[in-house]
């Protein structure tokens, strides 16, 4: 029985060239988290495994940093980074929970005049 819920930063925006922290939090469950995957569309960005720690996909090593916590930091953002990001929590005994974040990377001048999206 899956009783937990994933809380995410929801829809967020960031400036081109800047950094952003993607954060998910699993609540309302006592399930043991065995692994967290971070994915962009169908591309694996990183894994945080209970036994092995962090693994960053080689193609993202230069621009992705682990943490804080089970979150993920994206650096040197480009407009191409705009899109959906998913945190996938593998837990026992509940199973798999998925959270979604939409990131919009804005040109500097647009970002300076305020983000279109607010963190809930």
């Amino acid at each position: 029985m899956m009783t937990g819920t994933i809380e995410t930063t929801g829809n967020i925006s960031a400036e081109k060239g800047g950094s952003i922290i993607l954060q998910c939090h699993l609540s309302s469950t006592t399930a043991q988290v065995t692994q967290v995957n971070w994915e962009q569309q169908d591309q694996l960005l990183a894994i945080c495994n209970a036994d092995l720690g962090w693994h960053i996909s080689p193609s993202f090593k230069d621009r992705v940093a682990p943490g804080p916590g089970l979150g993920l930091t994206l650096q040197s953002l480009t407009v191409n980074d705009t899109g959906e990001y998913f945190c996938i929590y593998h837990t026992y005994p509940d199973g798999t929970y998925t959270g979604r974040i939409f990131l919009e990377v804005l040109e500097s001048s647009v970002a300076e005049h305020g983000a279109r999206f607010q963190i809930p």
Epitope: L44, H90, G95, T98
Partner: antibody, heavy 120, light 107 residues
């Protein structure tokens, strides 16, 4: 080349015990979760146990919980399944499987199996 | 436990035929579904994971689709090497469970 070789199967009386082994080669054994899956003669597949890469957690279905124990020796690249209080319905071909590091439920490599027969 | 129901349980087809196997989960499993192929006397082999992603080395005639509770494995043009039993497996929640299998036989 990934290779998984099971051994230790045989004929055992109901209530008896048996210990299966799986020798792994061709990959970094200590970096992968491992499972046992069984197949009764002429029947389908049933997942029996999983152990994390470092051995910090083990999970079982209710059908074997309390009777079977999965363990591993990363220094010997070997996976084990200790089966106690065996029943006729435990008769099956037992496969050792490697779990995909990205998605722990995926069995990406399988051994050829070792046959366990529980009969008086 | 989540029940996985495959249909048909067996089918007869000819080389070159398009073959479709379905798998239904008793509750939502998102895309956490794998397909395996097993030949007589052999170990199962991973074909597809995450409902539609082809495993390494698997021919492109195999494809998977679906999400939620309904999934499909399609072989676009059946080859002699494809006569086997196919199993689906869910990874949404413990215990991981398999479908009962679909045996693809030569017509």
């Amino acid at each position: 080349e990934v290779k998984l070789v099971e051994s230790g199967g045989g004929l055992v009386q109901p209530g008896g015990s048996l210990r299966l082994s799986c020798a792994a080669s061709g990959f970094a054994f200590s970096s992968f979760d491992m499972s046992w899956v069984r197949q009764a003669p002429g029947k389908g597949l049933e997942w029996v146990a999983v152990i994390s890469s470092g051995g910090s957690y083990t999970f079982y279905p209710d059908s074997v919980k309390g009777r079977f124990t999965i363990s591993r020796d990363n220094s010997k690249n070997t996976l084990y399944l200790q089966m106690n209080s065996l029943r006729a319905e435990d008769t099956a071909l037992y496969f050792c499987t490697r779990q995909d590091y990205r998605y722990p439920y995926i069995m990406d490599y399988w051994g050829q199996g070792t046959l366990v027969t529980v009969s008086s | 436990a989540i029940q996985m129901t495959q249909s048909p349980s067996s089918l007869s087809a000819s080389v070159g035929d398009r073959v479709t196997i379905t798998c239904q989960a008793s509750q939502n499993i998102n895309v956490w579904l794998s397909w395996y192929q097993q030949k007589p006397g052999k170990a199962p082999k991973l074909l597809i994971y995450k409902a539609s992603t082809l495993a390494s080395g698997v021919p492109s005639r195999f494809s998977g689709s679906g999400s939620g509770t309904d999934f499909t494995l399609t072989i676009s043009s059946l080859q002699p090497d494809d006569f086997a039993t196919y199993y689906c497996q869910q990874g949404q929640s413990y215990p991981w469970t398999f479908g009962g299998g679909t045996k693809v036989e030569i017509k």
